[in-house]
Amino acid sequence: PSGLVTANITDSEALARWQPAIATVDSYVISYTGEKVPEITRTVSGNTVEYALTDLEPATEYTLRIFAEKGPQKSSTITAKFTTDLDSPRDLTATEVQSETALLTWRPPRASVTGYLLVYESVDGTVKEVIVGPDTTSYSLADLSPSTHYTAKIQALNGPLRSNMIQTIFTTIGLLYPFPKDCSQAMLNGDTTSGLYTIYLNGDKAEALEVFCDMTSDGGGWIVFLRRKNGRENFYQNWKAYAAGFGDRREEFWLGLDNLNKITAQGQYELRVDLRDHGETAFAVYDKFSVGDAKTRYKLKVEGYSGTAGDSMAYHNGRSFSTFDKDTDSAITNCALSYKGAFWYRNCHRVNLMGRYGDNNHSQGVNWFHWKGHEHSIQFAEMKLRPSNFRNLEGRRKRA
């Protein structure tokens, strides 16, 4: 054989390739060895032109040999040398994170090293680099900014060799609200992009809840608890599903009555409803909004309307929640069953935002009576809540 080369070299693997012998051969015998590494020999088929070398030692120079066999005959041996990459450190972790300091720890690579390169970068693009000695497995970061997301990376060094980098992400404390209890507190912490956030009911880190925060509508800080937009999610669900919540928080979903009760029990909240249909928009805001606990069957309180959609929720004020399997409405018939949805029905509805998507039959669709009546199913609807005193909090934060 001829033209022996190695490719795809990592810290533990390499691929040997060669040009086959001109004559037909039975097999090739491959052997490879490195400093302090016993020789390994493998025999492969005569029509093979590459072989994966595995379980190699990192940062080691290997000598690779190959010759062909045909019966008792052996060809001359060809040789190549290659060096495996330096393996990366492992388990990089940020601990003891404070407002301006953090401790980075890691496990060393298998190969011996001459040092480590540490790089840490904040979200605003500030980058710092430091080289530490070969026996170091931790490093204290100082002079960090409070309430800031950092990415820390580490790379092992061995002379000219450099390992791949590994990274960890951490956030320094010093937030106004380390455990935000709603989206308004997340916003006051400096998060201004709408999307998924973790909130902590009553500020308790054991009560984490993933929510979608609307950070743009009317100043932002809203927990979205209902979204209808395309009809992909089934909203004709039972009591248990409405209590717990369902759907994809980035798409169509219901956050859950238990969650609404816990959130609105944290203080005084306001409700906002955003509606869109064929380029038209409308909204309704209620400055008092709460949902009772399971004992009250999640009784609705909604008062103090303003907006452009019309005051359709007032009809439902004081009502308990109804689903097809738990009828709490004041009608002889089961409203949820009749209108294929769930809501704080009375007899039956002015609002049916959990109705059948796209159904323009009377009272069956996604309805907000005082905007589009009962014979038009609205294309997009969101219900969301935030503290009633959000404007005051926002002003205080800006002054601070």
Epitope: D311, N317, A331, I332, R346, N347
Partner: antibody, heavy 120, light 107 residues
């Protein structure tokens, strides 16, 4: 107890104006919508006008739109109906009615009425 | 406007009999229907709201049913104090409209 007392009715010539008042007591006035409902002699009930609890929304029957104005003074627990350009067909007993809810819905308490006669 | 049609217009009935008054809406109104009783020279009184809910203080012999366009007020056993005119009213949309009334008198 909950009570509504109307006043301001009387005999008036066609084209003239009259202002009806309704004094409410026994409930939190601004928590409820209020209405005027009339009944012509020997006839049935006709809803005339309604106003939301906050006073922010007002509604009228087509027969009085542009001529009558409903208003409320929540500080005084009072409801009003300003009637302009009166016609003979406006002759009726005018009832003040409290709604069961903050928005127009169900008339759960009624006053005893005040008579308006439009005649030359 | 939504038209409300009551029948019958007059209903002579002996004391103790069951009385049924019907009310039909000209369009679908879910359960947005109320029933009132009016005695001569008196203001109307709310009996039933939301089609089937008995107002506080109203005797249980009164009941309401129906949904959509067709509604019924039933007096299970007519008492002397029940002789009056009964009106249905839709609260579904403005203007709120009443039926023309059903007069229940002594037979």
């Amino acid at each position: 107890q909950v009570q509504l007392v109307e006043s301001g009715g009387g005999l008036v010539q066609p084209g003239r104006s009259l202002r009806l008042s309704c004094a409410a007591s026994g409930f939190t006035f601004d928590d409820y919508a209020m209405h005027w409902v009339r009944q012509a002699p020997g006839k049935g009930l006709e809803w005339v006008s309604g106003i939301s609890g906050s006073g922010g929304s007002t509604y009228y029957a087509d027969s009085v739109k542009g001529r009558f104005t409903i208003s409320r003074d929540n500080a005084k627990n009072s409801l009003y109906l300003q009637m302009n350009s009166l016609r003979a067909e406006d002759t009726a007993l005018y009832y003040c009615a409290k709604d069961k809810y903050p928005v127009l819905d169900t008339f759960d308490i009624w006053g005893q009425g005040t008579m308006v006669t439009v005649s030359s | 406007d939504i038209q409300m049609t009551q029948s019958p217009a007059s209903l002579p009935t002996p004391v103790g009999d069951r009385v049924t008054i019907t009310c039909r809406a000209s369009q679908y109104i879910q359960g947005f229907l109320n029933w009132y009783q009016q005695k001569p020279g008196k203001a109307p009184k709310l009996l039933i709201y939301d089609a089937s809910n008995l107002e506080t203080g109203v005797p249980s012999r009164f009941s309401g049913s129906g949904s959509g366009t067709d509604f019924t007020l039933t007096i299970s056993s007519l008492q002397p104090e029940d002789f009056a005119t009964y009106y249905c009213q839709q609260s579904y949309s403005t203007p709120q409209t009443f039926g023309q009334g059903t007069k229940v008198d002594i037979k």
